[in-house]
Amino acid sequence: MALPTARPLLGSCGTPALGSLLFLLFSLGWVQPSRTLAGETGQEAAPLDGVLANPPNISSLSPRQLLGFPCAEVSGLSTERVRELAVALAQKNVKLSTEQLRCLAHRLSEPPEDLDALPLDLLLFLNPDAFSGPQACTRFFSRITKANVDLLPRGAPERQRLLPAALACWGVRGSLLSEADVRALGGLACDLPGRFVAESAEVLLPRLVSCPGPLDQDQQEAARAALQGGGPPYGPPSTWSVSTMDALRGLLPVLGQPIIRSIPQGIVAAWRQRSSRDPSWRQPERTILRPRFRREVEKTACPSGKKAREIDESLIFYKKWELEACVDAALLATQMDRVNAIPFTYEQLDVLKHKLDELYPQGYPESVIQHLGYLFLKMSPEDIRKWNVTSLETLKALLEVNKGHEMSPQVATLIDRFVKGRGQLDKDTLDTLTAFYPGYLCSLSPEELSSVPPSSIWAVRPQDLDTCDPRQLDVLYPKARLAFQNMNGSEYFVKIQSFLGGAPTEDLKALSQQNVSMDLATFMKLRTDAVLPLTVAEVQKLLGPHVEGLKAEERHRPVRDWILRQRQDDLDTLGLGLQGGIPNGYLVLDLSMQEALSGTPCLLGPGPVLTVLALLLASTLA
């Protein structure tokens, strides 16, 4: 009598008792060993002699033991063991070769849920098609941004498939990119074809400057045309200064003679002279440098009648050397609010910054910082680290300058200084930050989030949590629960809904008793381990009329995994045609008891299930 194959497999979860049970079933011929199980027990794959074959716990191996594993050894492991290995490699920060990464990715047969737990660079080798849908792809490509794309050569198939998928994920139509798009693409921005360079030069050229490899022909031609065109951000070559040349360093090889001829020759000479003096300028890996103030003219006395008595519109017409000679730094500092009301060229702003730097070498006072305006964009993170910003008004004023753009390193440093100065993320600060940067909260580590007082949670809007991962929601959910505890049922649910990705099973069960009618989008964000123990009746109550949406999501987690845990009879009561439940008459052994018995967490993930015919005894007797 042929019995269905046992599923899923034990992996590292087998206790001696369960192992004996399995052995008994195998010997009776009632459970066929599946391919992956055979691989683990050495029945089909080559014997595994290496360290990965049978350690009590992969996470107990040292980085040295993990470092040199060969692909052949990985191919003998189950998917769960491979995932466990990948997580251990990430935790121990083991640097892997391209071959090892490719091999690991190949063995992770289905898209991993816990992207944050995997080695960053491993994601480059996963197929982006496996992360379809706005949420999944956003999570995937947010992580890819931080990976080292240059592990893959430009022509590598894995790299070539990433860019189109990323563009689709971020909703880019045509060739026009925003600054946010370029930032979201990370290293993949270096692969954008020439048409993007042509249409989005203002935001893309500064990114291409720091691309490690040479640009391809198509990109070079587009960059050359854009630079020759003289549009933002660099302006016409005839107006370039030494600081422009500094900023353009990575693109200098693409310039071509027509552009070089139109740059003022004095500038080219000054730049060459400095480049030859300073060997660091010849290092190709140095990324884009902030334009620095350069004294390109001799210090000259201020012409008579030009000495600035106040900061007014007449300064618009001052040349750089005149600003340097005729504007007193103390006057500038006391009238910073006026500076903000007058348009200066970026070159003039360089001079003004230089004057303030000389006046305040230890860092600017807050009275000056609050009125920096566009001058803030000239500051480096190093400048900002010298500041002591305590007023929320100052913070707002500077965030306003950067409004509409992604968070720059300057803004990140400013926020960091401000929050550290306050000691915690209070409600007003959080309100302000999320108003300017809805994703701010999700850019914090779980450790940083732990300093958020529950009272601040009232300031959080659902969109502020869009990019949070499960680890962050695990920290935020208990705080939200505490913050909203005195609200009544329906109001409570409205507030807690966006935090539920961190909710445990018992809270979901409690919610199912309150007619909350959770929508599918929220349900899909719940923790898989929290959803699995829910009964069909509980899920039906939890979703209310939205339960019909389960059909459309039956192939996706957590719905897919939940279906596998339910009796088919129970699923049928929903009338949705959900398939994949446990057939009638099957016995379910929940091996998660292993954790309680051995004290070692089961590495397979939540509640592995082994299905065997309940008629076992009857058949034996027969």
Epitope: E313, N340, A341, P343, F344, Y346, L349, G373, Y374
Partner: nanobody, 117 residues
């Protein structure tokens, strides 16, 4: 995307006149300042004339005061620079620009003006 395009440049005898035009397109209404700048070969770019769109108040560099006039036609999204009594030292590439409080943000490609004596 914001675009600025100058026209009207050319060669003229000293004492002559020219009218430069700048066509602006894209989302330019939010920019409070419009202006004309010039750059002669090997020289730094210098401001010539600017207009504050909040009250149409105009400002000029000392070297062109009384000879040049800046104006705008809001309906047509145009900025003009009327140049009279031109001198050889006015020869340069003239560019229009628009900006916020605090900084000039967008620049045109420039149009060449040559004044011969």
């Amino acid at each position: 995307q914001v675009k600025l395009e100058e026209s009207g440049g050319g060669s003229v005898q000293a004492g002559g006149s020219l009218r430069l035009s700048c066509t602006t397109s894209g989302y330019t209404n939010s920019y409070k300042w419009m202006g004309w700048f010039r750059q002669a070969p090997g020289q730094e770019r210098e401001g010539v004339a600017v207009i504050y769109t909040g009250n149409d108040r105009t400002y000029y560099s000392d070297s062109v005061k009384g000879r040049f006039t800046i104006s705008r036609d809001n309906a047509k999204n145009m900025i003009y620079l009327d140049m009279t009594r031109l001198r050889p030292e006015d020869s340069a590439v003239y560019e229009c620009a628009i900006g916020h409080d605090g900084a000039w943000r967008y620049w045109g490609q420039g149009t060449q003006v040559t004044v011969s004596s």
